[in-house]
């Protein structure tokens, strides 16, 4: 009796179970009662990453330098190329099809997490006692200067964008 279901890594065709092609190979011809499934290797710059019955391999992804992309990991016959972004840029999506410039944190905000090839800069507002007076993709919020440790007094209070200004203590007359 012809099978109605096949084992893992097999498929049903013409009332018989044929082996799927292994990753890195494509289907040329189904099996027959005389011969096994005919599979051939994917060509250069092609891949198939699963057990399959595909008659065509997929093209490796192209990391387009015009979009700020570069190769992070070269593809094989079984894996796609992985793209990432040039220094200072990050991917716009998980698939990393294009890149945008890392965001800078404005004055009053500091870098909570430095950007990577796949994630943007994360900024945080400088809390009381901290400031940032530059627009930067790297600088964290800096603590206000401690006037006391310098035997000085606060002459001008700090803000989230400016440091405190210290000055000499008034002498007792």
């Amino acid at each position: 009796e012809p099978p109605t279901a096949c084992r893992e890594k097999q498929y049903l065709i013409n009332s018989q179970c044929c082996s799927l092609c292994q990753p890195g190979q494509k289907l040329v011809s189904d099996c027959t009662e005389f011969t096994e499934t005919e599979c051939l290797p994917c060509g250069e710059s092609e891949f198939l990453d699963t057990w399959n019955r595909e008659t065509h391999c997929h093209q490796h992804k192209y990391c387009d330098p015009n979009l700020g992309l570069r190769v992070q990991q070269k593809g094989t016959s079984e894996t796609d190329t992985i793209c990432t972004c040039e220094e200072g840029w990050h991917c716009t999506s998980e698939a990393c099809e294009s890149c945008v410039l890392h965001r800078s944190c404005s004055p009053g905000f500091g870098v909570k997490q430095i950007a990577t090839g796949v994630s943007d800069t994360i900024c945080e507002p400088c809390p009381v006692g901290f400031f940032s007076n530059v627009s930067s993709a790297f600088e964290k919020c800096h603590p206000w200067t401690s006037c006391e440790t310098k035997d000085l007094v606060v002459q001008q209070a700090g803000t989230n964008k400016t440091d405190v200004v210290c000055g000499p203590q008034d002498r007792l007359r």
Epitope: V28, T32, E38, L40, P41, G43, E44, T55, H56
Partner: antibody, heavy 115, light 111 residues
Amino acid sequence: QVQLVQSGAEVKKPGSSVKVSCKASGGTFSSYAISWVRQAPGQGLEWMGMINPSGGTTSYAQKFQGRVTMTRDTSTSTVYMELSSLRPEDTAVYYCARGFRMDQWGQGTLVTVSS
Amino acid sequence: QSALTQPPSASGSPGQSVTISCTGTSSDVGAYNFVSWYQQHPGNAPKLIIYDTRKRPSGIPDRFSASKSGNTASLTVSGLQADDEADYYCSSYAGNNNLVFGGGTKLTVLG
């Protein structure tokens, strides 16, 4: 069991074209590639190219590039091989066969090129 | 691609073994385990007897065996019989959807 039945013998003049057909029965037509192979009298086998009936994509041996065209008609489960600009040295038996592995063969079609 | 190299002829007596070689390059025989062997009797279409370098289609007797070392594939016919007298061809996948044949070997069964 796949069976491949080819068209009959042809006699052609130099410079003309020939179109040989190969009709498949048994199995699923779109699930195997078809190779074309020729054999000149008293000579060895020569692979000419292949066609993948599922998408119609072709691959031709460098020697025949520009002179050979392989097509398919899914409605009749038939593939065709057309060779143009025929010369006397194209006189041969032309075979179609299943896959690159060529596990089933047509009976062959004799093409004679003579003035 | 240039043809694979086979000896033009080989011979043996009934019951003996004979081996036919098929030499290619590192771009075909050496690169892939996709060598096939065919038997062709005069006036007939070729018949597949070995595929994927060493596998036999069902129905092909185990007197036919094959192997590969480097860029050379070999077909061995053991226990030679009169009906084994035929032409034998090897073929190999050569990458990029291309295939190449050997020039063929005429096997004669003596006696």
